[in-house]
């Protein structure tokens, strides 16, 4: 069971990143699915290595003082969502913006029907060029 | 099937990084090989988690305006190469240069004879000290 | 065999990061253990994918000129410790400090009784908020 999905620009104002089965994507079988273009949902309980990579372009003057934060989050059936992993990068002083990349990854127990998704502080800063931003998992 | 190889400084002007089976490297068996010191080639079709880490030292004034980009690329037999993953970091203002690290990783389907390699915008900026720059894969 | 542990602030002056089985941690069975809150120790020989993520907050003026370096290290029985992976990030100019995240990961052969740990140049700069700093492994 494995998946690797590719970032998709979105007009939605949500902080949850959007993904697509496009380009050189992976969706090994129907035991993992991409739901609503925003979350990877698993059917089988078990340990999964889950990862995300986010490249963004920001400028210190044009952004809020808070850093750019990418969060890998879990939504289990009947539970509130929770943060699994987070990474933070201070905005660049480069103009018009400076690109930076964040990588997150870890081993987590998922229940049947659990979903994982990626949240960022400012989706408009995310880079969607080939290979820059992706999300996936593999069952151990 | 797994491999982990270590960066090697090169006098070549190519943008493709060079690797060696040295230090604490891994080469599990002959189903994965390091070819020409530049690419990991697999004999078996399947899903692989492929990763690379690149540490580099650059300075904004001494570098081009474009960021430092590391790309994980795939060359399948009879096909043009393609980008699987990329990460970008804007150059530092630190002098003489500021070190930064990039990590790339994802799950991809590889065909028999497929090769993966790492491309960077400026190989002369890459750090080759112990543990700083490495490349590997594992078959799921 | 898999583990994922969560960073813990420590009053110790050691450069070795401290970890805990808290929050959404993973400890699959007793073939991997967290020892003294500082190292993951395995009982079985084999290939492991080992990873660490460290988020830190630093300022160029308040820090030494040397970059922030995170190292993933190995201690095998009867051997000196050795560096497996390192990542470096130059300090930010943001005030009071600028957050940055480092991710390390690779495939390594571990002997029975081998331990892995994470070393940083300045533990006081490490961010311990939910999900920011973690450490884990999985047996292939």
């Amino acid at each position: 069971i494995a998946a690797h999905v590719i970032s998709e620009a979105s007009s939605k104002t949500t902080s949850v990143l959007q993904w697509a089965e496009k380009g050189y994507y992976t969706m090994s079988n129907n035991l993992v699915t991409l739901e609503n273009g925003k979350q990877l949902t698993v059917k089988r309980q078990g340990l999964y290595y889950i990862y995300a990579q986010v490249t963004f372009c920001s400028n210190r003057e044009a952004s809020s003082q808070a850093p750019f934060i990418a969060s890998l989050c879990l939504k289990s059936p009947g539970r509130f969502e929770r943060i699994l992993l987070r990474a933070a990068n201070t905005h660049s002083s480069a103009k018009p913006c400076g690109q930076q990349s964040i990588h997150l990854g870890g081993v987590f127990e998922l229940q049947p029907g659990a979903s994982v998704f990626v949240n960022v502080t400012d989706p408009s800063q995310v880079s969607h060029g080939t290979g820059f931003t992706s999300f996936g998992l593999l069952k151990l | 099937i797994a491999a982990h190889v270590i960066s090697e400084a090169s006098s070549k002007t190519t943008s493709v990084l060079q690797w060696a089976e040295k230090g604490y490297y891994t080469m599990s068996n002959n189903l994965v090989t390091l070819e020409n010191g530049k690419q990991l080639t697999v004999k078996r079709q399947g899903l692989y988690y492929i990763y690379a880490q690149v540490t580099f030292c650059s300075n904004r004034e001494a570098s081009s305006q474009a960021p430092f980009i590391a790309s994980l690329c795939l060359k399948s037999p009879g096909r043009f190469e393609r980008i699987l993953l990329r990460a970008a970091n804007t150059h530092s203002s630190a002098k003489p240069c500021g070190q930064q690290s990039i990590h790339l990783g994802g799950v991809f389907e590889l065909q028999p004879g497929a090769s993966v390699f790492v491309n960077v915008t400026d190989p002369s900026q890459v750090s080759h000290g112990t543990g700083f720059t490495s490349f590997g894969l594992l078959k799921l | 065999i898999a583990a994922h542990v969560i960073s813990e602030a420590s009053s110790k002056t050691t450069s070795v990061l401290q970890w805990a089985e808290k929050g959404y941690y993973t400890m699959s069975n007793n073939l991997v253990t967290l020892e003294n809150g500082k190292q993951l120790t395995v009982k079985r020989q084999g290939l492991y994918y080992i990873y660490a993520q460290v988020t830190f907050c630093s300022n160029r003026e308040a820090s030494s000129q040397a970059p922030f370096i995170a190292s993933l290290c190995l201690k095998s029985p009867g051997r000196f410790e050795r560096i497996l992976l390192r990542a470096a990030n130059t300090h930010s100019s943001a005030k009071p400090c600028g957050q940055q995240s480092i991710h390390l990961g690779g495939v390594f052969e571990l002997q029975p009784g081998a331990s892995v740990f994470v070393n940083v140049t300045d533990p006081s700069q490490v961010s311990h908020g939910t999900g920011f700093t973690s450490f884990g492994l999985l047996k292939l």
């Epitope: 080939t130 | 009879g78 096909r79 043009f80 190469e81 393609r82 980008i83 491309n119 | -």
Partner: nanobody
Framework: EVQLLESGGGLVQPGGSLRLSCAAS????????MAWVRQAPGKGLEWVST????????YYADSVKGRFTISRDNSKNTLYLQMNSLRAEDTAVYYC???????????????WGQGTLVTVSS
């Protein structure tokens, strides 16, 4: 809309050099192989050279090998052809073309520029 715009053609003496450029837009340039194809007066189309998406591999017709060099700058979405030691038989309209597939051996193109004329004459 995909656009390929060649420039750099002109009149040159035998043994001289020229550099052709092709500015690309309307597609993700770094994802595609690119080629130069030429058509001599009164003749059919002749493939000249191909470069892979990241510039890792280059391929040349025997007639130009060692004299022509294909290159690309993905940051500028531009393809180049450096032509040295030009001969009268290199006189042609040179077209920039986008490979239609990812297959290296398939010289099939889905988009073409309008061409730039290269005349080699004393």
């Amino acid at each position: 809309e995909v656009q390929l715009l060649e420039s750099g053609g002109g009149l040159v003496q035998p043994g001289g050099s020229l550099r052709l450029s092709c500015a690309a837009s309307g597609f993700t340039f770094e994802e595609y192989g690119m080629a130069w194809v030429r058509q001599a007066p009164g003749k059919g189309l002749e493939w000249v050279s191909t470069i892979s998406p990241l510039g890792i591999s280059t391929y040349y017709a025997d007639s130009v090998k060692g004299r022509f060099t294909i290159s690309r700058d993905n940051s500028k979405n531009t393809l180049y052809l450096q032509m040295n030691s030009l001969r009268a038989e290199d006189t042609a309209v040179y077209y920039c073309a986008k490979h239609a597939t990812s297959q290296e051996s398939l010289r099939s193109f889905d988009y073409w520029g309008q061409g730039t004329l290269v005349t080699v004459s004393s």
